[in-house]
């Protein structure tokens, strides 16, 4: 039960995280104009990964896409790549984790397969979250560097008469969305990995020894069976937890939820 809850919660947290990573990647407010020097500006600039926008106090907003690839800073390209890789890995992870969910039955999929898929999706979520956090952090670092560089030469005067105020940019909402979303995806991935441990069949835990009355051989039965003697009228070895509903020599098409202790 705890395993199913952990897996389900991990899936939901990762889903929210990936939705957040997608939202952050699409958002225009990765960097916003610093209003410290001029809080009542009539023109407000903000930039995203894909376009830059200008909002005028008149109510008009104009956005322009970055229609060049080669002309863009390498750091921006790197951030774009990290965010896209994060989204792709996250999306694949979500797809894999849907089939790995314990509460969903697909054909005759064994728990070991589900455990592997859960682990795979968990790792994908962790890498996806790390990509998002790395992308946002690289962009934030770029902003901090540029901020202090522009502060150093904020006013470039012409003989002290005319001032050209350089626009400084600070952290936009998308950065915070990205950090939180990346964190959530990472946490979701860790939860999936934890759930995987609980799902995996631990074959070394119990060895069931079956003693037959004839004494011809000793059969070692892997799985969660407890040893039971074959003496007396009860020649069939019953399993411990299912009240004798199914016997050892019945064919099991897939493991039941009672099979593991």
């Amino acid at each position: 039960m705890a395993v199913t809850a952990c897996q389900g919660l991990g899936f939901v947290v990762s889903l929210i995280g990936i939705a957040g990573i997608i939202a952050a990647t699409c958002m225009d407010q990765w960097s916003t104009q610093d209003l410290y020097n001029n809080p009542v500006t009539a023109v407000f600039n903000y930039q995203g990964l894909w376009r830059s926008c200008v909002r005028e106090s008149s109510g008009f907003t104009e956005c322009r896409g970055y229609f060049t690839l080669l002309g863009l800073p390498a750091m921006l390209q790197a951030v774009r790549a990290l965010m896209i890789v994060g989204i792709v890995l996250g999306a694949i992870g979500l797809l894999v984790s849907i089939f790995a969910l314990k509460c969903i039955r697909i054909g005759s999929m064994e728990d070991s397969a589900k455990a592997n898929m859960t682990l795979t999706s968990g790792i994908m979520f962790i890498v996806s979250g790390l990509c998002a956090i790395a992308g946002v952090s690289v962009f934030a670092n770029m902003l901090v560097t540029n901020f202090w560089m522009s502060t150093a030469n904020m006013y470039t005067g012409m003989g002290g008469m005319v001032q050209t105020v350089q626009t400084r940019y600070t952290f936009g909402a998308a950065l915070f969305v990205g950090w939180v979303a990346g964190g959530l995806t990472l946490i979701g991935g860790v939860m999936m990995c934890i759930a995987c441990r609980g799902l995996a069949p631990e074959e070394t835990n119990y060895k069931a020894v079956s003693y037959h009355a004839s004494g011809h051989s000793v059969a070692y039965k892997p799985g969660g069976f407890k040893a039971s003697t074959g003496f007396g009228s009860n020649t069939k070895n019953k399993k411990i937890y299912d009240g004798g509903a199914r016997t050892e020599d019945e064919v099991q098409s897939y493991p039941s939820k009672h099979d593991y202790v």
Epitope: V43, Y46, S57, S58, E62, V162, T164, T167
Partner: antibody, heavy 118, light 113 residues
Framework: EVQLVESGGDLVKPGGSLKLSCAAS????????MSWVRQTPDKRLEWVAT????????YYLDSVKGRFTISRDIAKNTLYLQMSSLKSEDTAMYFC???????????WGQGTSVTVSS | DIVMTQSPSSLTVTAGEKVTMSCKSS????????????LTWYQQKPGQPPKLLIY???TRESGVPDRFTGSGSGTDFTLTISSVQAEDLAVYYC?????????FGAGTKLELK
């Protein structure tokens, strides 16, 4: 057709109050920033105040801050300028104007005259 | 506050003549975000409210004759009337639309000889 009609101008004593109105028609009122601009007797233009489309942001000339209040009633398509503690230097023709691209004022009313004198 | 300085204060011209008037700002009106200059030109005829001619320093408002041309960038701007007509006699104001308070120049009065 875009129309802006100001009203409420009057002769008032220093320290008095006055409320100017500007009835707007012919455009989506809530989509545009609106401003009050005054023209002094020596024909100088002076921006007074601006309110954003939704009414969330207001901007004022320093000399009128705390004395004048710009507001808008979206339902009535009307812009207001509440003026209090009036001074003789507030004497002017007051125009309401619609802000457009580039923050430029593309439509102006005919103006309403405010005279502050004892 | 950004100070707008217009020159000359008045111009006496003959019909058909080319006219240029200047406007200088104490700070750059160029916005780095969209590379546009937030400078506006208005025309005001006696007894009328100002009329928008040019915004973004060089973009002509719809309905404005193409004899009116705005140019310049940063802090120095110019309004040019390629061939003055009688109906162009008015006062021309430039305005800072980049930073509050929005400030106007004192105006350039265009008169006929």
């Amino acid at each position: 057709e875009v129309q802006l009609v100001e009203s409420g101008g009057d002769l008032v004593k220093p320290g008095g109050s006055l409320k100017l109105s500007c009835a707007a028609s012919g455009f989506t009122f809530s989509s545009y920033g609106m401003s009050w601009v005054r023209q002094t007797p020596d024909k100088r233009l002076e921006w007074v105040a601006t309110i954003s489309g939704g009414g969330s942001y207001t901007y004022y000339l320093d000399s009128v801050k705390g004395r004048f209040t710009i507001s808008r009633d979206i339902a009535k398509n009307t812009l207001y300028l509440q003026m209090s503690s009036l001074k003789s230097e507030d004497t002017a023709m007051y125009f309401c104007a619609r802000q457009s691209r580039g923050n430029a004022m593309d439509y102006w009313g005919q103006g309403t005259s405010v005279t502050v004198s004892s | 506050d950004i100070v707008m300085t217009q020159s000359p204060s008045s111009l006496t011209v003959t019909a058909g003549e080319k006219v240029t008037m200047s406007c200088k700002s104490s700070q750059s009106l160029l916005n780095s975000g969209n590379q546009k200059n937030y400078l506006t030109w208005y025309q005001q005829k006696p007894g009328q409210p100002p009329k928008l001619l040019i915004y973004w320093a060089s973009t002509r408002e719809s309905g404005v004759p193409d004899r009116f041309t705005g140019s310049g960038s940063g802090t120095d701007f110019t309004l040019t009337i390629s061939s003055v007509q009688a109906e162009d006699l008015a006062v021309y104001y430039c305005q800072n639309d980049y930073s509050y308070p929005l400030t106007f120049g004192a105006g350039t009065k265009l008169e006929l000889k």
